[in-house]
């Protein structure tokens, strides 16, 4: 049976800073990718963003970046603003889903070691602290260096010079070898998902799962629907609807683009899912 | 969790019509679109229509001046009146509630079941 896993982290070097790793471990291909805060989407959750794997991502604050890693792995980049870290003790869930084949849902937290309330992390200043000892410590390497090529000059000058013959090589030959990187290299650093709001093409991503990520299927939901999908074009952000008691669908006023998908059914309305197929409107 | 239930699907024969009703029910996510998507046997699945949060209905070319989507607030229902019907509208018609991408996309985010819809020569 398919399997979602869900990884939190806390950036080592800003404690405000996390992100939420998510996969799939399954047959079939993924059409939508939903990551909630709060709980399962759906059921008291707060959605994050919605990734389509070839019509780009849609977030809302704290994210900061939702991308792909793999065809069935996403990663999300939180930024949190407040002074107290409330994502430390905070359940993400990511939800995959096929249509009409299903959904699957998992949910995990920030591992409580990492917890900054219960292990003391480091603070700026000894951060700070080391840099400096990195660069007081190269800068030392470099004057003793400096002094040593000196004595050696030094003593050149005494020493008398040997007479160059004359030689018939090239003196091309002799040119040394500028080293810059491969086009192979420069591409293999390029990351073309890094982006929010890009596309992505199946059919060149190879990352591999990484080392240590563990499965967490913690409150999988899983929701039979009964096979696949396709699309394709760029992402347009729309309107707002607010929810009315036992309204299905109520209009209200303009919302800036990006700012939350605004169609509810019913009311206490939070949290996203979704899937695909396409539209041939004109 | 969401509980989308479709219904009145059914055999006709050719030229006739059907009214597929979608109920929504314990829904607390907030999408941006509600719609038909279908699917027929061996063929890719494909939206039919969606209202958005504009409220203008969008259709896919193959149907467009034969259905018609709509919806009532007040029953928590969806519509989908089917006229003019052909044999390459038979599928099993989906209710979907969805995130938009672009004008003409409503991505699914939850369904119902589905409802079959046959139509005969």
């Known amino acids: 049976t398919p399997e979602v896993w869900v990884q939190v982290q806390m950036e080592a070097t800003e404690l405000s800073s996390f992100t939420v790793h998510c996969g799939f471990l399954g047959p079939g291909s993924i059409s939508l990718v939903t990551v909630s805060w709060g709980g399962p989407d759906g059921a008291g959750g707060t959605k994050l963003a919605v990734l389509h794997p070839e019509l780009g991502t849609r977030q809302w604050a704290p994210a900061r970046q939702a991308r792909w890693e793999t065809q069935s792995s996403i990663s999300l980049a939180l930024e949190d603003s407040g002074a107290s870290s409330p994502f430390a003790n905070t359940t993400f869930c990511c939800k995959f889903a096929s249509f009409p084949e299903g959904s699957w849902e998992s949910c995990g937290s920030l591992p409580p070691s990492s917890d900054p309330g219960l292990s003391a992390p480091p603070t700026p200043v000894p951060i700070l602290r080391a840099d400096l000892a990195g660069i007081l410590g190269l800068s030392g390497v470099l004057l003793f260096g400096c002094g040593y090529l000196l004595h050696l000059l030094r003593r050149q000058k005494h020493r008398p010079t040997p007479r160059l013959q004359p030689s018939h090589t090239n003196s091309q030959a002799l040119t040394a070898q500028a080293w810059a990187p491969s086009q192979a290299s420069q591409a293999a650093l390029h990351d073309p998902y890094a982006t929010i709001n890009t596309s992505f093409c199946p059919a060149t991503l190879d990352t591999a799962h990484p080392n240590g990520w563990a499965s967490l299927p913690t409150h999988a939901a899983h929701q039979p629907q009964g096979p696949a999908a396709s699309a394709s074009t760029p992402i347009l952000a729309r309107g707002s609807f607010v929810s009315v008691e036992n309204g299905l669908y109520t209009q209200a006023g303009e919302r800036p683009p990006h700012t939350g998908p605004g169609l509810t059914l019913f009311p206490d309305c939070r949290g996203p899912r979704a899937v695909e197929g396409r539209f041939g409107v004109r | 969790d969401v509980q989308l239930v479709e219904s009145g699907g059914g055999s006709v024969q050719a030229g006739g019509s059907l009214r597929l009703s979608c109920v929504a029910s314990?829904?607390?996510?907030?999408?941006?679109?509600m719609g038909w998507f279908r699917q027929a046997p061996g063929k890719e699945h494909e939206g039919v229509a969606h209202?958005?949060?504009?409220?203008?209905?969008r259709y896919v070319d193959s149907v467009k001046g034969r259905f018609t989507i709509s919806q009532d607030h007040a029953k928590n229902t969806l519509y989908l009146q089917m006229n003019s019907l052909k044999p390459e509208d038979s599928a099993t018609y989906y209710c979907?509630?969805?995130?938009?991408?672009?004008?003409?996309?409503?991505?699914?985010?939850?369904w119902g079941q589905g409802t079959q819809v046959t139509v005969s020569s």
């Open positions: 209202i958005d949060s504009d409220g203008i209905p």
């Open positions: 979907v509630v969805g995130f938009k991408f672009d004008d003409d996309y409503c991505a699914p985010n939850d």
């Open positions: 314990r829904y607390t996510s907030r999408t941006d679109c």
